[in-house]
């Protein structure tokens, strides 16, 4: 060292800005200066390292007025590469001077070209777009050639401007862009061996997603309680924030503030700042603001704090003291206007006992009682009990709930018949509607007349949108009304109104309606009043069982309000299956006031016409085909035979006599009478009985004597029998004359 002029900065034994040495060598570095000084070493060199020795500054140089110190590093390693600085200790005289000297020492090692190797896990490097980014792959020798790559296969080439290489610092990217986000690696090949150190760039963002304060505003406290406000800032993963509070006691530092980061979320960071004031006073009331800042981004959140000297309760009706709702509502809220602090205990009573114990449908929500699925059972008196035990404060208030019910007609709910009933012509009928509702419904009876046109078949003759007329007992609309009456009755524990309409004489078809209404709504029940002159609305008749050669006459009568599409069919069984055969040459059905008639006549039947004949009609309401069957057995023809032959007979003059000629045969034989071979005709004094089977002679005379013959005839043949009638006694004819 020379002993020249005063040293403004310490002087190092190694000249220049850098020095290259080989790993394993010893580094000697002396520092001489005008004042006491200290050493600053690279972070990779530990002051506790046994290989490092630093002599304390001791007198040296010009008359021992200078200070010298020696740094010795035995067996230097690659990671000892870095900036070594000798610095004057701070004194009042040296403050203004640049009081240090530095040299960058490269400890070159072919086996460790990079000072820091990040192979197992890449080193995280934070970046902000538009700012300088350094990929700190510092090397142990300034001669090492380093390449910067981005996974998977991009190379970031230094251009001397945007990307530059500095062996002391690494790659310097002047203004980072999204292109530098990713897994970057520095590669160096030394003596044919590839070395890689990895870095993961992490974009620093300023995105504040949300700021909240818990508990929510307003926060109410009693004097002496503890205020705790938790401000939560949610940000993107790569965002850092500064959090601060503005509050009434900030100047006197009334609050203690703690901060923490929650990193458990996979896509966000959550920052917490917790403000706490013990023993709040009225001076602590006011606005508390949590301020969150990240770069140029800023968000804040306010909450107001109220401090009360003592507790209080005030309760009023939110609506009227008497409230109304409707049965069947999904829910009803009984609500009171309550101002209280601290939060009181709440109990709701229904008719004097705890509501929530009465039914699981009662839910307490704040100062409201929510009644789910309202029923008539929910009508009653509801009392809210409010209590703050520690303040010995208690209040209550009662509201009455009326549950209205839309009218219901009981008969509508019971399963109705698929098709309407029929009312026999001329009959007396009692029609009933049992009604329930709150308030009690008003019941009226109405009459809907039907189109009454029997000139043709009508299936839509009676529709419900016809004009309707309100009925009273004196109405002469439709059928004669005997009475309309109402009575109250208890059914299944509830008061119901039974309204009865008595029809005196069922003559006119139509629709009777009972209509029940109250302020909640209206309900109507339609009673189709179909009058029938046919028993059960469907009747089949056979004039008589025909014999071969006779005519088959069948008649089908159906109620025209209930049936349509009337037809005769013949049922035949083939292979255990019943087949329906339509019958041709059917007559047209005739429509009367109440019914439709379809006659079937089959002339000159044969045995083959025997079978099951059915009248089929379609029920207008159900669409179902209804069959009414009748068995027809065509009787085989049989020649006549007499059950008893005539026998000779004597009769007194002026007496009377009966000759009997009972014959059987199929078809029933025709009986003809002869006297002395002359056909007998009915005339005064001679009477032919039923089917000509008897011959009755009144006041017998001599002329009546003779041979009487009866002849029974049908298609199969004839049979006859004769007898002689003798008249006894003389004639007094001459006397009479």
């Amino acid at each position: 060292y020379g002993s020249g002029s005063k040293l403004k900065v310490p002087e190092l034994s190694l000249k220049g800005t850098q020095h290259v040495m080989q790993a394993g060598q010893t580094l000697f570095l002396k520092c001489r200066g005008e004042a006491a000084h200290s050493w600053s070493l690279p972070t990779t060199v530990s002051q506790e390292d046994k290989r490092l020795s630093i002599t304390p500054p001791s007198a040296c140089g010009r008359d021992n007025r200078q200070f010298c110190s020696t740094l010795t590093l035995d067996t230097a390693q690659a990671n000892h590469t870095g900036l070594y600085t000798c610095r004057y200790l701070p004194t009042s005289t040296s403050k203004k001077k640049k009081a240090e000297s530095s040299i960058y020492i490269f400890v070159s090692d072919a086996g460790s070209p990079f000072i820091e190797m990040h192979t197992d896990i890449p080193k995280l490097v934070h970046m902000t777009e538009g700012r300088q980014l350094i990929i700190p792959c510092r090397v142990t020798s300034p001669n090492v050639t380093v390449t910067l790559k981005k996974f998977p296969f991009d190379t970031l080439t230094p251009d001397g401007q945007r990307i530059t290489w500095d062996s002391r610092r690494g790659f310097i990217i002047a203004n980072a862009t999204y292109k530098e986000i990713g897994l970057l690696n520095c590669e160096a090949t030394v003596n044919g061996h590839l070395y890689q150190t990895n870095y993961l760039t992490h974009r620093q963002t300023n995105t504040i997603l949300d700021v909240q304060i818990r508990p929510p505003s307003p926060v109410r406290l009693l004097h002496g309680q503890t205020l705790v406000l938790n401000c939560t800032a949610t940000t993107e993963l790569n965002t850092r924030v500064q959090m601060s509070w503005n509050y009434p006691g900030k100047a006197t530092k009334r609050a203690s503030i703690r901060q923490r980061i929650d990193r458990s979320h996979s896509h966000n960071n959550v920052f917490h700042s917790v403000l706490k004031i013990n023993n709040v006073e009225s001076r602590d009331k006011g606005l508390y603001t949590c301020r969150v800042k990240s770069g140029s981004s800023f968000q804040s959140f306010n909450t107001s704090v109220h401090v009360y000297e003592k507790g209080f309760i005030s309760v009023k009706h939110r609506k009227q003291p008497v409230q109304e709702t409707t049965a069947g509502r999904r829910s009803y809220r009984l609500s009171m206007k309550v101002k209280a602090f601290p939060s009181p205990e709440i109990v709701w009573l229904k008719d004097g006992s705890p509501a929530t114990l009465k039914s699981a449908r009662y839910l307490v929500h704040g100062y409201s009682l929510i009644i789910k699925d309202v029923t008539t059972e929910d009508a009653g008196d509801y009392t809210i009990l409010l209590g703050i035990k520690q303040s010995r404060l208690f209040k209550n208030l009662t509201a009455t709930l009326i549950v209205n019910v839309k009218p219901q007609i009981y008969e509508k709910s019971v399963s109705s018949l698929p098709s309407p009933p029929l009312y026999p012509l001329g009959s007396r009928q009692v029609l009933t509607c049992t009604v329930y509702g709150i308030p009690r419904p008003t019941i009226t009876w109405l009459w809907h007349p039907c189109h009454h046109n029997h000139s043709k078949e009508r299936y839509d003759f009676c529709t419900e949108n016809e004009e309707s007329f309100i009925l009273d007992p004196s109405s002469n609309l439709g059928n004669r009304i005997e009475s309309i009456s109402q009575r109250m009755t208890v059914i299944e524990g509830t008061n119901k109104t039974v309204s009865t309409l008595v029809v005196a004489d069922s003559q006119t078809p139509g629709i009777y309606s009972c209509r029940a209404f109250n302020k909640i709504g209206t309900v109507e029940r339609n009673i189709k009043f179909y009058v029938t002159d046919v028993p059960n609305g469907f009747h089949v008749s056979l004039e008589k069982m025909p014999a071969e050669g006779e005519d088959l006459k069948l008649s089908c009568v159906v109620n025209k309000f209930l049936y349509r599409d009337i037809t005769w069919i013949l049922l035949r069984t083939v292979n255990n299956r019943t087949m329906h055969h339509s019958i041709s040459k059917q007559k047209m059905a005739t429509t009367q006031d109440y019914s439709i008639t379809l006659n079937l006549v089959i002339k000159n039947v044969s045995l083959e016409d025997s079978g099951t004949y059915a009248c089929r009609a379609r029920n207008i309401y159900t669409g179902e085909d209804i069959l009414r069957k009748t068995e027809v057995l065509v009787r085989d023809s049989e020649a006549p035979h007499l059950l008893q032959n005539l026998s000779d007979y004597e009769v007194s003059i002026s007496g009377s006599t009966t000759l009997d000629c009972q014959a059987r045969g199929v078809p029933a034989p025709q009986i003809t009478w002869f006297k002395n071979n002359h056909k007998i005709q009915q005339e005064p004094g001679i009477i032919l009985g039923p089917g000509n089977s008897t011959l009755f002679i009144e006041r017998v005379t001599e002329e009546d004597e003779g041979v009487y013959r009866c002849r029974a005839t049908n298609q199969k043949g004839a049979v006859e029998s004769a007898a002689y009638l003798t008249v006894q006694g003389t004639s007094d004819k001459s006397n009479l004359e």
């Epitope: 896990i121 996974f151 998977p152 999204y178 292109k179 990713g182 590839l194 993961l200």
Partner: antibody
Amino acid sequence: EVQLLESGGGLVQPGGSLRLSCEASGFDFSTYAMNWVRQAPGKGLEWVATINSEGTITSHAPAVKGRFTISRDNSKNTAYVQMNSLRAEDSAVYYCSSTTGTTHGMDVWGRGTTVTVSS
Amino acid sequence: QSVLTQPPSASGTPGQRVTISCSGSSSNIQNNYVYWYQQLPGTAPKLLIYFNSQRPSGVPDRFSGSKSGTSASLAISGLQSEDEADYYCGTWDDSLNGWVFGGGTKLTVLG
């Protein structure tokens, strides 16, 4: 929510072509490399192609080189693979994958789209 | 034939520890990071391990990865029935200039 959704699969005859698309949402698509990986029925995963974040560098598996082309449109947040001269052995479920966080492996996968090459 | 070699199957009973190996070469495993993927039946693969040994958030600490030279391994401790799946190792291959995968290991949880 971070998502990849593949589309364009279907039945094609040998020698035919298909273009598969992969639409990304919920992350900064233009920042990361994209990959296509396939899986034949009952088989393992097979890398098909990779494209860098800007779409300037691509790499294809030897089995598909010259027949398949990977591309991307950062304005549409979509990656594509154009498949020509298809063969029966190309039948597979095709997945697109990306990296969206700090892993730089395939940390986000689509549900896959099925390609069947058959006459 | 896969570039990385894995055993085709592995098994264990609930609570046991199982290890799945993956071997490669200097152009892939030795010079690059190893990733492990889990594929449950009928679903897309899911990243299980990255940078040889790191777990993404949401992956239980029962799963661990390691790498040594040209080999890597996945260890699952405290085996659970829901761990039954196919496991694949994957890495970048410098000579191929692309990703390579192992053939997959089917893990069966017995009993």
